[in-house]
């Protein structure tokens, strides 16, 4: 066959679908690789062809569109399963071609099983809710296009294994779930099961997402430097190891980049000749507030080093702060025979 622009196996789009449920999979060519849409391609005389490679096989084979009840069908740029079977797992290829043009891409499709509590190997999207922030809502995801707007599906929400008849502050509102005041206890996996009729059959769509309750922007503050502070003086003799921790608290802020860095005499440690190492550790609270600690370490400090300015800096979307560490050279303890005796007027 003549040359075809082959975009290879698009592993970025690892598509996972539940067994025995409808699935509609759009050809990724039009979404991510080509600059035109299916309608344009179709009106230009291009044809979309689908084929697949079964799991653990190398042989590409055409998709059987003549299964009973049209179990697999194609509609425009969408491949439909009504419903999926476990052995539909494999790599699927959509190819757009005519006599002079050809472009194709493959993508992996995994049909996964779930248990009665909706546990499965499915990768779950995470939805963050602000703690005690007033009414917030989540929407049953990825159900568009499965049924026309004239069809009114029934939607049942679950938290973990339990049907949400009403969890008091968690209220099912059809396709949406309202959290009156989100609390830490609302953390968990939420599943919506959408049931709809089609051609005398009943189909179910199961969608699970993880809810994580995080710090509210109402409570967010600029970074707080706990260390260094005015109460601790780093007093060292030359030759000793100097260790200064910079510990900074960051309120949770959606999409904020939290940064901590040291300057020595106004320069980044990388830009000076001192043999300095910096180790960072990060911990999170239950609401994803963050504490970052950067320990500045000089193995064998010199008297010059002890005269330098060591400043810890921190920045988030809420602002920037800095704090200097109090570093000084330890005054050697007096030797009794000479210094102390002189002090008493001995000759």
């Amino acid at each position: 066959s003549e040359r075809c622009d082959d975009w290879g196996l698009d592993t970025m789009r690892q598509i996972q679908v539940f067994e025995d449920e409808p699935a509609r999979i759009k050809c990724p060519l039009f979404e991510h690789f080509l600059k035109f849409n299916y309608s344009t391609a179709h009106s230009a005389g291009l044809t979309l062809i689908w084929y697949w490679t079964r799991q653990d096989r190398d042989l590409e084979e055409p998709i059987n569109f003549r299964l009973p009840e049209n179990r697999i069908s194609k509609e425009k740029d969408v491949l439909w399963f009504r419903p999926t079977l476990l052995n539909d797992t494999g790599n699927y290829t959509c190819m757009l071609r005519n006599t002079t043009y050809c472009s194709k891409v493959a993508f992996p499709l995994e049909v996964v099983q779930k248990d009665s509590c909706f546990n499965s190997p499915m990768k779950l999207p995470v939805h963050k809710l602000y703690i005690e922030y007033g009414i917030q809502r989540i929407t049953c995801p990825n159900v568009d296009g499965y049924f026309p707007s004239s069809v009114k599906p029934t939607i049942t929400w679950y938290m973990g294994c339990y049907k949400i008849q009403n969890f008091n502050n968690v209220i099912p509102e059809g396709m949406n779930l309202s959290f009156l005041i989100a609390l830490i206890s609302n953390n968990g996996n939420y599943t919506c099961v959408v049931t709809y009729p089609e051609n005398g059959r009943t189909f179910h769509l199961t969608r699970t997402l993880t809810v994580k309750v995080v710090g509210s922007p109402k409570n967010a503050v600029p970074p707080v430097i706990h260390s260094p502070n005015d109460h601790v003086v780093y007093e060292k003799e030359p030759g000793e190891e100097l260790l200064i921790p910079c510990t900074v608290y960051f309120s949770f802020l959606m999409d904020s980049r939290n940064e901590v860095w040291w300057t020595i005499d106004g320069k980044k440690p990388d830009d000076i000749t001192i043999d300095v190492t910096i180790n960072e550790s990060i911990s999170h609270s239950r609401t994803e507030d963050e504490t970052r600690t950067q320990i500045l370490s000089i193995k064998k400090v010199t008297s010059e080093d002890l005269k330098r300015s060591y400043v810890c800096h921190a920045r988030s979307a809420k602002g920037e702060v800095a704090k200097a560490a109090k570093v000084k050279q330890k005054v050697p303890a007096p030797r009794y025979t000479v210094e102390l005796a002189c002090g008493f007027g001995a000759t």
Partner: antibody
Amino acid sequence: QIQLVQSGPELKKPGETVKISCKASGYTFTDYSMHWVKQAPEKGLKWMGWINTETGEPTYADDFKGRFAFSLETSASTAYLQINNLKNEDTATYFCARGSFPWFTYWGQGTLVTVSA
Amino acid sequence: DIVMTQAAFSNPVTLGTSASISCRSSKSLLHSNGITYLYWYLQKPGQSPQLLIYQMSNLASGVPDRFSSSGSGTDFTLRISRVEAEDVGVYYCAQNLELPFTFGSGTKLEIK
């Protein structure tokens, strides 16, 4: 069937305390939050807040923080609204309403509280 | 807080004709999920409020289909196609997009 039955009218003096009740029946009381709504004479409706009937945790609208308290007697499937240090402007009908979708489908019949010296 | 604004009285209507009641919110009630969190309640004389419409255009259970509602994110209209004597009362719009939930001041439906 689902019902919310409130206690009878109250006549109180300024500075006194009133406690009105809302008894629920026909459903599991702890499954649904209970909300309170104030309606002053010839005035509109004002949402006062709600109580989580599972945990007993109240949430008050800003105008109702301080002298107002929501409480529960779960064993009796009853929610209470207590108003301390009554003022003339507390004269109103107070409604309880069940928090569920679609919102406030079930209301109590209302309790008229009259504050007068 | 979101402020809901209503006229105190409707234009007087004749029984059997249609009536419209308006409501405006100080902020769009259209959520990113596509739902408009606007509700209509009717309070008949001496009674508790009753839910008529939820999420802008959905008829509550048991409400006759003479009632309908439409609107944008901030401007809403409740329409009664053939007014009956039992429709008399005060109509409140309300929002539950955000806490605190807020109600309009109410519009009294007047019959000629």
